[in-house]
């Protein structure tokens, strides 16, 4: 049976806003990951920058609902954003219990479907709330 | 097919600790959580908590927090769940199950000097 | 914790009859993501429990079609249309929305 969806938590330092209202998050002691369980969905989200060949966390936790991209088995990550030139935020959504603690892949910037770079432009605190 | 086997009856001594296993087979271990349910002499069943094996993490009946650790070992697919301190309180019928769905056979715990 | 109160909590029958055990919640299992954590389980008796229902009414695989589940927010139903042999044992309803998760106190079914 179902479990209620349990996701991997984490906020980088300096991220505006916070979606730990989204769900209760476990007594993990100092480990880990840090988990949380959703209270609206049943679906995980995550969020990395991508910075010519490094990956970033900056996101993770659960979705505030069901949407499409949620049916997801793993996190397949989509460009979203340019929060700075040679920078590109790439999101995921997916289904499963800790989907979101790693991407499947990232397709390598200036692949075909990353914004061009007249893409979408963000401070970097706002950059998130645009990927979401 | 899916099987969960637990290992075998413990006799303990009040005070002292018990750790039994639960080998899972039939599935990827890793994709389910773990839970343990203790079923005392005639009552109902309790929820003691559960793991995820893919990285251990936990979740407790707040009852259970301090009695009851839970640990996977991922290479040989196995639960494992120690119980400290024990009194005849513990003394039950422990089951370890995939996510509720499958249920090993139980192990019989009984606490006597 | 989520009391989970099932009733009757004995139930002599004669095989082929209609049985239905209530399980009153003392609160809401509806969750904030729509899904109702409500399951239902036997326990024949020297083994260990069987799930026969999840999400309140979706059969668990192997569950005859004469076992019905249904219900919502705190009072759920488990059916049984004809009552067979290997139907007898103690059944549970269970919740997990709530933490910690609990069982009802349980119905056992027997022969008259």
């Known amino acids: 049976p179902p479990n209620r969806r349990t996701c991997v938590f984490f906020e980088a330092p300096g991220v505006r806003g916070s979606t730990k209202t989204l769900g209760e998050l476990l007594d993990t002691g100092t480990e880990l990951p840090r988990a949380i369980r959703c209270l609206y969905s049943r679906c995980c989200f995550g969020i990395w920058n991508l910075t010519q060949d490094r990956a970033q966390v900056e996101m993770q936790g659960c979705r505030d609902s069901d949407e499409p991209g949620c049916e997801s088995l793993h996190c397949d990550p989509s460009p979203r954003a340019h929060p700075s030139p040679g920078s590109t935020l790439f999101t995921c959504s997916c289904g499963t219990d800790f989907c979101n603690a790693n991407y499947s892949h990232l397709p390598p910037p200036g692949s075909p479907g990353t914004p061009g770079s007249q893409g979408p432009q963000a401070a970097p605190g706002e950059s998130i709330w645009m990927a979401l | 097919q899916v099987r969960l086997l637990q290992s075998g009856a413990a006799l303990v001594k009040p005070g002292a600790s018990a750790k039994m296993s639960c080998k899972a087979s039939?599935?990827?271990?890793?994709?389910?959580?773990v839970s343990w349910v203790k079923q005392s002499h005639g009552k109902s069943l309790e929820w003691i908590g559960e793991i995820y094996p893919d990285n251990g993490i936990t979740n407790f009946n707040e009852k259970f927090k301090g009695k009851a650790t839970l640990t996977v070992d991922k290479s040989t697919r196995t639960a494992y769940m120690e119980l400290s301190r024990l009194t005849s309180e513990d003394s039950a019928i422990y089951y370890c199950?995939?996510?509720?769905?499958?249920w090993g056979q139980g192990v019989m715990v009984t606490v006597s000097s | 914790d989520v009391v989970l109160t099932q009733t009757p909590g004995s139930l002599s029958v004669t095989l082929g009859d209609q049985v239905s055990i209530s399980c009153r919640s003392s609160q809401s299992l509806k969750y904030g993501d729509g899904y109702t954590y409500l399951e239902w389980y036997l326990q024949k008796p020297g083994q260990s429990p069987q799930l026969l229902f999840y999400g309140v009414s979706n059969r668990f695989s192997g569950v005859p079609d004469r076992f019905i589940g249904s219900g919502s927010g705190t009072d759920f139903t488990l059916k049984i249309s004809r009552v067979e042999p290997e139907d007898l044992g103690v059944y549970y309803c269970?919740?997990?929305?709530?933490?910690?998760?609990?069982f009802g106190t349980g119905t056992k079914l027997d022969l008259k």
């Open positions: 039939g599935y990827t271990f890793t994709d389910y959580w």
């Open positions: 269970f919740q997990a929305t709530h933490d910690p998760n609990t």
């Open positions: 199950t995939r996510q509720r769905d499958y």
